[in-house]
């Protein structure tokens, strides 16, 4: 829980807490911004990002963005607040412990994005259909 000496000295809205009143600590994410990638036509890929960061804000989750155009493939890894859009898209899967890629419509390129909320979960990005969250059994696993 929030220690009284901390609580008194700062506005409560600057400290994020969970339902039990425990202070929400930030998670760890791979954070290499945009890098060229060799990940293509695979069920899953590792990010090959060597930088693990403590997210700046406790509410932030891990995000990965995979993009392919005529010239190259890139993978972006960051922390991001799920209340805010990223690349103009809502992070609808932010509560997932795994980073399960979903295709998004972007003109001129193939664009996949995933978000997740466990430490370094954007290190392993999953494209395989067997992980699709339209499967109700998987939803049970994710949200238990």
């Amino acid at each position: 829980t929030i220690p009284p000496h901390v609580q008194k000295s700062v506005n409560n809205d600057m400290i994020v807490t969970d339902n039990n009143g425990a202070v929400k600590f930030p998670q760890l994410c791979k954070f290499c911004d945009v890098r060229f990638s060799t990940c293509d036509n695979q069920k899953s890929c590792m990010s090959n990002c060597s930088i693990t960061s403590i997210c700046e804000k406790p509410q932030e989750v891990c995000v990965a963005v995979w993009r392919k155009n005529d010239e190259n493939i890139t993978l972006e890894t960051v922390c991001h607040d799920p209340k805010l859009p990223y690349h103009d898209f809502i992070l609808e899967d932010a509560a997932s412990p795994k980073c399960i890629m979903k295709e998004k419509k972007k003109p001129g390129e193939t664009f996949f994005m995933c978000s997740c909320s466990s430490d370094e979960c954007n290190d392993n990005i999953i494209f395989s259909e067997e992980y699709n969250t339209s499967n109700p059994d998987l939803l049970l696993v994710i949200f238990q």
């Epitope: 829980t1 339902n19 425990a22 202070v23 600590f25 403590i54 949200f143 238990q144």
Partner: nanobody, 122 residues
């Protein structure tokens, strides 16, 4: 009863060094994830550094990378923060905290020390 007691704070000039300690008792220190968290006057919490157990992997906020080093001595139940190349913006109350899952997914509990004040000023 879980207790965390920080020490080692004080007044230091910019560019100087300090070593903070956190003496832990009332729990099995060697199995816990431990953090240093700071709070500058009138500001929110900044999560400075984390050390895992087992394995001792360490992580740092971008603002302190390359300057601060977190470590632990499990035989002494003590957590440390070595702070070098200190800057005025490092002025804050520094807390050690422990955090672990309750077993319910996404739910954690945490314990905090009383904090130690670090002032960086010429």
């Amino acid at each position: 009863e879980v207790q965390l007691l920080e020490s080692g704070g004080g007044l230091v000039q910019p560019g100087g060094s300090l070593r903070l300690s956190c003496a832990a008792s009332g729990f099995t220190f060697g199995t816990e994830q431990m953090w240093w968290v700071r709070q500058a006057p009138g500001k929110g919490l900044e999560f400075v550094s984390r050390i895992d157990s087992p394995g001792g992997r360490t992580y740092y906020a971008d603002s302190v990378k390359g300057r601060f080093t977190i470590s632990r001595d499990n035989s002494k139940n003590t957590l440390y923060l070595q702070m070098n190349s200190l800057r005025a913006e490092d002025t804050a109350v520094y807390y050690c905290a422990k955090r672990r899952p309750t077993g319910v997914s996404g739910t954690f509990y945490d314990y905090w020390g009383q904090g130690t004040l670090v002032t960086v000023s010429s």
